[in-house]
Amino acid sequence: EKPVYELQVQKSVTVQEGLCVLVPCSFSYPWRSWYSSPPLYVYWFRDGEIPYYAEVVATNNPDRRVKPETQGRFRLLGDVQKKNCSLSIGDARMEDTGSYFFRVERGRDVKYSYQQNKLNLEVTALIEKPDIHFLEPLESGRPTRLSCSLPGSCEAGPPLTFSWTGNALSPLDPETTRSSELTLTPRPEDHGTNLTCQMKRQGAQVTTERTVQLNVSYAPQTITIFRNGIALEILQNTSYLPVLEGQALRLLCDAPSNPPAHLSWFQGSPALNATPISNTGILELRRVRSAEEGGFTCRAQHPLGFLQIFLNLSVYSLPQLLGPSCSWEAEGLHCRCSFRARPAPSLCWRLEEKPLEGNSSQGSFKVNSSSAGPWANSSLILHGGLSSDLKVSCKAWNIYGSQSGSVLLLQGRSNLGTGVVPAAL
């Protein structure tokens, strides 16, 4: 059976600008090697060109001129002796779009252009994006190697240039960010930020880029307590908060981390295995009681570590008045006043708006004061009779407020009654 000229190659191939494509191809031609065996030369030409003097796009013939614009980019791949005419096209350019034909030459008898089986090449705009590879998860403080590569790209043509951009890269020197690989040591603040790898073919206008959002795992770095959205001051891992007894209190504890830390509140300073009073970041006290003075701890538990903060709660109350009440006794007029407040209040007596301090040098009055817990008691002894109607007042105050009460004492040893006068300092 007589061998014929045959070519098997796909009719059309599409490649994106700047990328590579391999076009598989095989051929046959009539050859009987009885005597001599001249070399086999194969060629790929642009359609419409005259094989005898046109520049080729690819050949295995070292004596034929190759088009400068395809030099190094269009290459024969495979063994032509085994009738392999596969064509590799690298760094495809828009101007490469068009038809190509294959030609075989051997000795004087074999000179044939396969015009019936043309290859149609279409170069389209680059839409392929590079891939950014790295081992996940990224962990704060742990160096990680990232690489950027473009699927479908190859060594052909001018080298690729890379540029990396992103907040996570701020400390890197510019040289580092121009390589296809870089080492990144992520920080907590890099979580959720974008990292972009941009690729460009040197001397070409073709650029493509891929952006990834960094998922950085990190332990809680800070822990903050908010009251109605306002952060409380923190000194040496402790926050101090004075709260009025009976007042409602709602606090939010937050410790940003990734994945989110488990937040819980404990009474006092807990052991590691203590039972929380709240399994969320929210501590809600409907009515603050004096028993709750001392404090609470917010703990943020995370696979990479835990953090806690102590809330020193000081429960205070405004002075509450019992009295004054006065009665006549053997030594004279005896008045008593009791106040309750947190912190314990200071007390003073007034006679007709004049303060009575300590004991009088003439022995006309005597003041005794004592305090136990939140209560303060004071007694006033006035010696001798009353020359006229008298107003006796007692007043208590602490840093949060004051209250006073008074009694009007009438001549004739009876009293008109008591009046309680609340006052703010």
Epitope: Q221, F226, A231, L241, R250, G281, L318
Partner: antibody, heavy 116, light 107 residues
Amino acid sequence: QAYLQQSGAELARPGASVKMSCKASGYTFSSYTMYWVKQRPGQGLEWIGYINPSSGYTEYNQKFKDKATLTADKSSSTAYMQLISLTSEDSAVYYCARSDSKGDYWGQGTTLTVSS
Amino acid sequence: DVVMTQSPSSLSASLGERVSLTCRASQDIGNSLNWLQQEPDGTIKRLISATSSLDSGVPKRFSGSRSGSDYSLTISSLESEDFVDYYCLQYASSPLTFGAGTKLELK
């Protein structure tokens, strides 16, 4: 240094909605609550509410409950406030502010003008 | 809501003078009060937190104190940049409320 950049002035028709933004930089966005404040021309300040970006937890002034919606996008470190059913009463400067135990940081304000 | 009554609403003073602004709380707010400064261009910054803690970078001539339900911001010696607006903010209970403001003017 923490910095809050608010979106530009808005002009809206009565009945319309607007969404203003507050982009945070220079700190970890999710670490601090963001609160919003309204200031009518020549008047004082009114608290609208706050959002905790790390959990999405929000709390509103009852007065603004049906007017404002606070959201936060951690990926872009941006807090948003949407105001609906606008009336001339909503014409004001709106501030976002971040609260921190070491200091508050306020945005420069977004001026909203509601006019037909 | 907690009403913060701020006084005076405006105050004329001279350079180097000592002035005090006051906010009175209608309910107990403990030490949950901040003082803010607003410049004519709208820029706002916190001066004092938790009644008396001076924010970093704030000049030491500013101080905060409390007496019962009265909260004071004192400027010990006025400088030209202090002639702006001041507001108090309580955060003890929701909603947070501000004082109506004090305009400090150069005499």
